[in-house]
């Protein structure tokens, strides 16, 4: 089943997010991803936890998952590199780099997204864009077309309240508000984009969606710049 968590959002403008990837297992959408280099897609490590024997592929240039589109192309994965410290039972270090079988054919609908290298928190209240093909309601309806929502960043101290995430949010994670608008199941691994720069990746822990007391949790890419650079090198 798809992992992670867009509720309360709307359909994205087609191909306006050319960095957006669908990580697929046996031909079905599993998680979001983001093209960070010509041959590399960044996603969440937990996405591949249950993918042991399945065929993992990456869809780029897509708006609709099912309809033919000139820019769409499915790439095989040459190498999957989860963060070495990621573990099944924690949300920490939930990053995965997927090396495509070949360099992506770039164009208006397929283009890498610059990612944040300066390890400084995004200011609370900043509106950031999260997109994905994750479920759009509590009944679990999966969209065919890419959805997105703008979410305000939430400060870490609030996010760490006992009623919220009770101390689980380290400096390597960030939160965004989740009051009816939220990332949801199937959005994991997708990008949180602030000011046109990739700041976070949707974590793939199981979490209730759209509840203001359970904010969305995102892995801060700037905190993993050294690791990302070392894998891409």
């Amino acid at each position: 089943p798809p992992r992670g968590r867009i509720l309360g959002g709307r359909e994205a403008e087609a191909h306006a997010r050319p960095y957006m990837a669908s990580v697929q297992l046996n031909g079905a959408h599993l998680c979001g991803g983001v093209l960070v280099a010509e041959q590399w897609v960044l996603s969440a490590a937990h996405c591949l936890e249950d993918a042991a024997d399945g065929k993992v592929q990456v869809l780029l240039g897509a708006h609709s998952l099912s309809q033919p589109e000139p820019s769409k192309r499915l790439y095989d994965v040459l190498r999957a590199v989860p963060h070495p410290d990621s573990q099944p039972d924690t949300i920490d270090h939930d990053l995965l780099l997927l090396q495509l079988s070949e360099k992506a054919t770039l164009g208006p609908a397929v283009r890498p997204l610059p990612w944040q290298r300066v390890d400084r928190d995004v200011a609370p209240g900043t509106l950031c864009d999260v997109a994905g093909w994750g479920i759009v309601n509590h009944a679990g309806r999966r969209p065919d077309s890419l959805q997105h929502v703008l979410l305000p960043v939430l400060d870490r101290a609030t996010c760490n309240r006992r009623t919220h995430h009770d101390g689980a949010i380290t400096e390597r994670l960030m939160c965004a508000e989740s009051n009816r608008r939220d990332s949801c199941k199937g959005d994991s691994g997708g990008p949180l984009v602030c000011g046109g720069v990739l700041e976070g990746v949707v974590t793939s822990g199981s979490r209730v969606c759209g509840n203001r007391k359970k904010p969305g949790i995102y892995t801060r890419v700037a905190s993993y710049a050294a690791w990302i650079d070392s894998v891409l090198a």
Partner: antibody, heavy 115, light 107 residues
Framework: QIQLVQSGPELKKPGETVKISCKAS????????MNWVKQAPGQGLNWMGC????????IYADDFRGRFAFSLETSASTAYLQINNLKNEDMATYFC????????WGQGTTLTVSS | SIVMTQTPKFLLVSAGDRVTITCKAS??????VAWYQQKPGQSPRLLIY???NRYTGVPERFTGSGYGTDFTFTINTVQAEDLAVYFC?????????FGGGTKLEIK
């Protein structure tokens, strides 16, 4: 290990000002709000409010608006409670406690108000 | 403000007894209730959070239950070291109000 260490006992006169400190160690100070709790002699616990250590924004319970102020010295990982124009009813033990991620309390600061 | 009405105020029990303390919230606080123990001259100590979760290192004889407005805290087999005052607290919304406390005395 995680610790909250409060300043020592205070003896003040009515009308004076007191500032109680709560120094945190063993964790990233700005990751957790700090609560302040009042306990009058022989009485129960009274949540005064809290301060968001990340943004600096305080929240005060209704009974603690006006003469009471929470502040931070982030570089020293320290939260402060200041009480102005002290009254006899302010005589109590004041506790700081970390909000979330476990159970961490200061040892308490006893304030005596006497003319 | 949400009022937390805690009963009883005092309990006189013998070692080995089962003790039940209740807290009633003036409006729903879902499961956002904690229970604290405070021994004389000490800071409060968290025993139960989210109404029923036992905090790390807390003995199994301490249990909590409830949802919405009605909450119960139980000590299954009271021991001499349980002499203390017990408080409930709601952290559903600010102000994060406490109950009035229950003083537990051992015969």
């Amino acid at each position: 290990q995680i610790q909250l260490v409060q300043s020592g006992p205070e003896l003040k006169k009515p009308g004076e000002t007191v500032k109680i400190s709560c120094k945190a160690s063993g964790y990233t100070f700005t990751n957790f709000e700090m609560n302040w709790v009042k306990q009058a002699p022989g009485q129960g616990l009274n949540w005064m409010g809290c301060i968001n250590t990340y943004t600096g924004d305080p929240i005060y319970a209704d009974d603690f608006r006006g003469r009471f102020a929470f502040s931070l010295e982030t570089s020293a990982s320290t939260a402060y409670l200041q009480i102005n124009n002290l009254k006899n009813e302010d005589m109590a033990t004041y506790f700081c406690s970390r909000e979330g991620g476990g159970d961490y309390w200061g040892q308490g600061t006893t304030l005596t108000v006497s003319s | 403000s949400i009022v937390m009405t805690q009963t009883p105020k005092f309990l006189l029990v013998s070692a080995g007894d089962r003790v039940t303390i209740t807290c009633k919230a003036s409006q729903s606080v879902t499961n956002d209730v904690a229970w604290y123990q405070q021994k004389p001259g000490q800071s409060p100590r968290l025993l139960i959070y989210h109404a029923s979760n036992r905090y790390t290192g807390v003995p199994e004889r301490f249990t909590g239950s409830g949802y919405g407005t009605d909450f119960t805290f139980t000590i299954n087999t009271v021991q001499a070291e349980d002499l203390a005052v017990y408080f409930c607290q709601q952290d559903y919304s600010s102000p994060r109000t406490f109950g009035g406390g229950t003083k537990l005395e051992i015969k």
